[in-house]
């Protein structure tokens, strides 16, 4: 599946409890990014 969110900009993680982030880190924690970087959700059958 194509990645609808670009992954060139790596934002810092947010500090829980703060009212504001230092960066917008949603792209780094998006569904799209997980498809690029994560384990294969359904391994291919042999």
């Amino acid at each position: 599946l194509a990645d609808p969110l670009d992954h060139r900009d790596a934002g810092d993680l947010w500090f829980p409890g703060e009212s504001e982030s230092f960066e917008d880190a949603h792209v780094e924690h998006s569904i799209s990014r997980s498809l690029l970087e994560g384990e294969i959700p359904f391994p291919p059958t042999s």
Partner: antibody, heavy 114, light 112 residues
């Protein structure tokens, strides 16, 4: 294929409770930040809750309109997020979407009425 | 809260003609790393919202390059170079930088 499927909506009386679920599939779930966004009929989008990942200690954030009444949670083993809604008000009537901000579910309708 | 405003709220467009929607935030959405946390969504009639543009100017996957996003820290524009019938719906801008996250009121694009 990425899927986000909300369920649990329905008709509830003011002051009542309801628990929404959002079952996800088709992507590695554990590191994804998830949200609930709602939309009253004919109105705009309102973000109401956000939950981060285990690596972020499952930090949660809420809109003032639902703080203290709604609770967002997640079960990584079931790749599902939840929205526990208590002390419901008529103004909570809306379609509730779960989203990763890039992908959205189809929504589930909550009606609060006596 | 960060207030997001949009104009116009209603936009009748002739197919094939360009269209432009403005969005303004009550505070800067530009981060120290040069990322601007401004997103555009389209909600077609009877459907869920779909992501068009993220971080102000990045086109989401599967979105035609007729769509483009631009702007500064507080003033943003979504442009459609040539409107097609399938573009009808409500366009929302949103910020995901400061809690609570907020959406604009929406711009309803309709075909003349």
């Amino acid at each position: 294929e990425v899927q986000l499927v909300e369920s649990g909506g329905g008709l509830v009386q003011p002051g009542g409770s309801l628990k929404l679920s959002c079952a996800t599939s088709g992507f590695p779930f554990s590191n994804v930040w998830m949200h609930w966004v709602r939309q009253a009929s004919g109105k705009g989008l309102e973000w109401i809750a956000h939950i981060k990942a285990k690596s972020d200690n499952y930090a949660t954030y809420y809109a003032e309109s639902v703080k203290g009444r709604f609770t967002i949670s997640r079960d990584d083993s079931k790749t599902t997020i939840y929205l526990q809604m208590n002390s419901l008000k008529t103004e909570d009537t809306a379609v509730y979407y779960c989203t990763g901000l890039d992908y959205w579910g189809q929504g589930t309708t909550v009606t609060v009425s006596s | 809260d960060v207030v997001m405003t949009q104009s116009p709220l209603s936009l009748p467009v002739t197919p094939g003609e360009p269209a432009s929607i403005s969005c303004r935030s009550s505070r800067s959405l530009l981060t120290s790393k040069g990322i601007t946390s401004l997103y555009w969504y389209l909600q077609k009639p009877g459907q869920s919202p779909q992501l068009l543009i993220y971080r102000m100017s990045n086109l989401a996957s599967g979105i035609p390059d007729r769509f483009s996003g631009s702007g500064s820290g507080t003033d943003f524009t979504l442009k459609i170079s040539r409107v097609e019938a399938e573009d009808v719906g409500v366009y929302y801008c949103a910020q995901f930088l400061v809690y609570p996250y907020t959406f604009g009121p929406g711009t309803k694009l309709e075909i003349k």
